[in-house]
């Protein structure tokens, strides 16, 4: 029985050239988080394995930094970074939980963070 919920930063925006932290948090379960995958559409950005540590995809090594925590920091943002990002929590023994974040990269300096929301 999967009882957990993923809380994410929801819809967020950031300035071109700036950086942003993608964060998810798994709650309402005692399951052990064994691995978190960060993906953009079907492209793997990074993995944080509870035992093996971090793996950053070679194509993103220059612009992605691990953390804070299980989160991911995107740097040197471009308008092409606009889109959906997914945090995929692999847990034991529950299984897999997925959270969604939509990032909009703006040309101007009027970037505002959206409200947090939950995905069951």
């Amino acid at each position: 029985m999967m009882t957990g919920t993923i809380e994410t930063t929801g819809n967020i925006s950031a300035e071109k050239g700036g950086s942003i932290i993608l964060q998810c948090h798994l709650s309402s379960t005692t399951a052990q988080v064994t691995q978190v995958n960060w993906e953009q559409q079907d492209q793997l950005l990074a993995i944080c394995n509870a035992d093996l540590g971090w793996h950053i995809s070679p194509s993103f090594k220059d612009r992605v930094a691990p953390g804070p925590g299980l989160g991911l920091t995107l740097q040197s943002l471009t308008v092409n970074d606009t889109g959906e990002y997914f945090c995929i929590y692999h847990t034991y023994p529950d299984g897999t939980y997925t959270g969604r974040i939509f990032l909009e990269v703006l040309e101007s300096s009027v970037a505002e963070h959206g409200a947090r929301f939950q995905i069951p």
Epitope: T34, Q35, N37, E39, D42, L44, A46, I47, N49, A50, D51, L52, H55, S57, I88, H90, Y92, P93, G95, T96
Partner: antibody, heavy 124, light 107 residues
Framework: QVQLQESGPGLVKPSETLSLTCAVS?????????WAWIRQPPGKGLEWIGS???????YYNPSLKSRVTISVDTSKNQFSLKLSSVTAADTAVYYC?????????????????WGQGTMVTVSS | EIVMTQSPATLSVSPGERATLSCRAS??????LAWYQQKPGQAPRLLIY???TRATGIPARFSGSGSGTEFTLTISSLQSEDFAVYYC?????????FGGGTKVEIK
């Protein structure tokens, strides 16, 4: 190059405990990777038994969890499997394997290297 | 747990022909899928990981594709040494699970 070698009794009596050891050569067991046990009953498919990380994190197949213990001995560079209360259904070839050797380069976890396997028969 | 289903159970192919093996996951595993080859009396050998990356020393005639729940292993031109049983396996979710296998036999 990393090599794995299983050892242990080939015959175990019903209700007893099956004990196997996997000796690792060419790599320090405490440097990383998962260390896994997988079995294959005669003429059947592969079944993952469980995996351990050198720090002590263990993950077991739910169907076997109540009977399985996997441990690591870093001083001997080996890891072990204990399966209690065995029955004829536990008769199988038991393999040890390395899991995660490609993780740091590619981010994927698979059973990269396998031992040759050891046949264990449960019979009185 | 994620259930892996392979089809067909047996595939009869002539040497030199193409073989296409399928593997389906009961829920999405993204591209976290591996393929193994096992010959009689031998341990399985890793062929493909990450759904499409060939392991070290694996010939180019072996290729993997797919993402999510549907995966394919293709052997472009079967050699005599390719007749064996092939298994797919998912990770990282625990428990690790294997498909039931596809036996590729000589037609």
């Amino acid at each position: 190059q990393v090599q794995l070698q299983e050892s242990g009794p080939g015959l175990v009596k019903p209700s007893e405990t099956l004990s196997l050891t996997c000796a690792v050569s060419g790599y320090s067991i405490s440097s990383g990777y998962y260390w896994a046990w997988i079995r294959q009953p005669p003429g059947k498919g592969l079944e993952w038994i469980g995996s351990i990380y050198h720090s002590g994190s263990t993950y077991y197949n739910p169907s076997l969890k109540s009977r399985v213990t996997i441990s690591v001995d870093t001083s001997k560079n080996q890891f072990s499997l204990k399966l209690s209360s065995v029955t004829a259904a536990d008769t199988a070839v038991y393999y040890c394997a390395i899991e995660g050797a490609n993780y740091y380069d590619f981010g994927y976890v698979a059973f990269d290297i396998w031992g040759q396997g050891t046949m264990v028969t449960v019979s009185s | 747990e994620i259930v892996m289903t392979q089809s067909p159970a047996t595939l009869s192919v002539s040497p030199g022909e193409r073989a296409t093996l399928s593997c389906r996951a009961s829920q999405s595993v993204s591209s976290n899928l591996a393929w193994y080859q096992q010959k009689p009396g031998q341990a399985p050998r890793l062929l493909i990981y990450g759904a499409s990356t060939r392991a070290t020393g694996i010939p180019a005639r072996f290729s993997g594709s797919g993402s999510g729940t549907e995966f394919t292993l293709t052997i472009s031109s079967l050699q005599s040494e390719d007749f064996a049983v092939y298994y797919c396996q998912q990770s990282p979710p625990w428990p690790r699970t294997f498909g039931g296998g596809t036996k590729v036999e000589i037609k």
